[in-house]
């Protein structure tokens, strides 16, 4: 049980890191292709992982202008990196009732990133609220 909770913590630390990558990309929002992308909001309970995968699948792209192309492309690539599998993620994969990615409202990059960040924060909040007190190393 301890190693499973440590695995969950490590996983959530990855989510924590993704928030910083989203924040980094928000600095370069004017250098992103102004395309409308599916952006889940007010995601229903137990559909968080489904919504997360929608954000990861979205075609966020650099507009290939200026000096920021490299950092933008690296950041997008890191956002799309598959997180380590967890029991919570596996359980949610079997839910067939979650909305499809295409059913979510499409938003420009700025709002897309804001909604992605909100979802990540919600997932961390749920994780930290559901476990006993003690640090990520305990």
């Amino acid at each position: 049980h301890k190693s499973s909770s440590q695995g969950q913590d490590r996983h959530m630390i990855r989510m924590r890191q993704l928030i910083d990558i989203v924040d980094q990309l928000k600095n370069y929002v004017n250098d992103l292709v102004p395309e409308f992308l599916p952006a889940p909001e007010d995601v229903e309970t137990n559909c968080e992982w489904s919504a997360f995968s929608c954000f990861q699948k979205a075609q966020l792209k650099s507009a290939n202008t200026g000096n920021n192309e490299r950092i933008i492309n690296v950041s997008i690539k890191k956002l799309k990196r598959k997180p380590p599998s967890t029991n919570a993620g596996r359980r949610q994969k079997h839910r067939l009732t979650c909305p499809s990615c295409d059913s979510y409202e499409k938003k420009p990059p700025k709002e897309f990133l804001e909604r992605f960040k909100s979802l990540l924060q919600k997932m961390i909040h749920q994780h930290l609220s559901s476990r006993t007190h003690g640090s990520e190393d305990s």
Partner: antibody, heavy 116, light 107 residues
Framework: QVQLVQSGAEVKKPGASVKVSCKAS????????MHWVRQAPGQGLEWMGT????????IYSQNFKGRVTMTRDTSTSTVYMELSSLRSEDTAVYYC?????????WGQGTLVTVSS | DIQLTQSPSSLSASVGDRVTITCRAS??????LNWYQQKPGKAVKLLIY???RLHSGVPSRFSGSGSGTDYTLTISSLQPEDFATYFC?????????FGGGTKVEIK
């Protein structure tokens, strides 16, 4: 147990560069990002930036952009912070800090004095 | 950038006292608020993360609370080793920012 051991104090002239190291042990080095924070004499804490040791990805504070470079050496589990074009106001204690859900473990600090 | 205003900037207290330090953010930080302890010549220590979670090895006399923009660190019964400077830090948005610190001194 988690330990972050930083390099020793440095004295530098204005315009020079300084490179501070932070050697990590007691955990999987590539699992946690490392942040750098500084504290000028009698002042508060100021965030400088962060590095992901798994791939050298960095995010820098706008206050230091163009002057700071963070790197890592996975073979020795060490991260480095180099600050260039030093000025007297860069005199401070520089800290590395591991980031989990917060800056959960800190190095002992490295005093960098910039003086002509 | 998110500003964090800590108060008081210093306080004098006696062993056994209950001490409360507050941290106000310039915008809602959704509980992404951490508290640290700093002693001269020692490594900074994390006390509380995500508003109220006690870090490993931290005595239970330390507690945190709050939401939105207002957060509190409480030491229920001050011990001799608690005389130090305390900082809050927000983890909601880059750049990471810190409060100005609260120095807890012996009365």
């Amino acid at each position: 147990q988690v330990q972050l051991v930083q390099s020793g104090a440095e004295v530098k002239k204005p315009g020079a560069s300084v490179k501070v190291s932070c050697k990590a042990s007691g955990y999987t080095f590539t699992d946690y990002w490392m942040h750098w924070v500084r504290q000028a004499p009698g002042q508060g804490l100021e965030w400088m930036g962060t590095i992901d040791p798994s791939d050298n990805y960095t995010i820098y504070s706008q206050n230091f952009k163009g002057r700071v470079t963070m790197t890592r050496d996975t073979s020795t589990s060490t991260v480095y912070m180099e600050l260039s074009s030093l000025r007297s106001e860069d005199t401070a204690v520089y800290y590395c800090a591991r980031y989990g859900f917060a800056m959960d473990y800190w190095g002992q600090g490295t005093l960098v004095t910039v003086s002509s | 950038d998110i500003q964090l205003t800590q108060s008081p900037s210093s306080l004098s207290a006696s062993v056994g006292d209950r001490v409360t330090i507050t941290c106000r953010a310039s915008q809602d930080i959704s509980n992404f608020l951490n508290w640290y302890q700093q002693k001269p010549g020692k490594a900074v220590k994390l006390l509380i993360y995500y508003t109220s979670r006690l870090h490993s090895g931290v005595p239970s006399r330390f507690s945190g609370s709050g939401s939105g923009t207002d957060y509190t660190l409480t030491i229920s019964s001050l011990q001799p080793e608690d005389f130090a400077t305390y900082f809050c830090q927000q983890g909601h948005t880059l750049p990471r920012t810190f409060g100005g610190g609260t120095k807890v001194e012996i009365k």
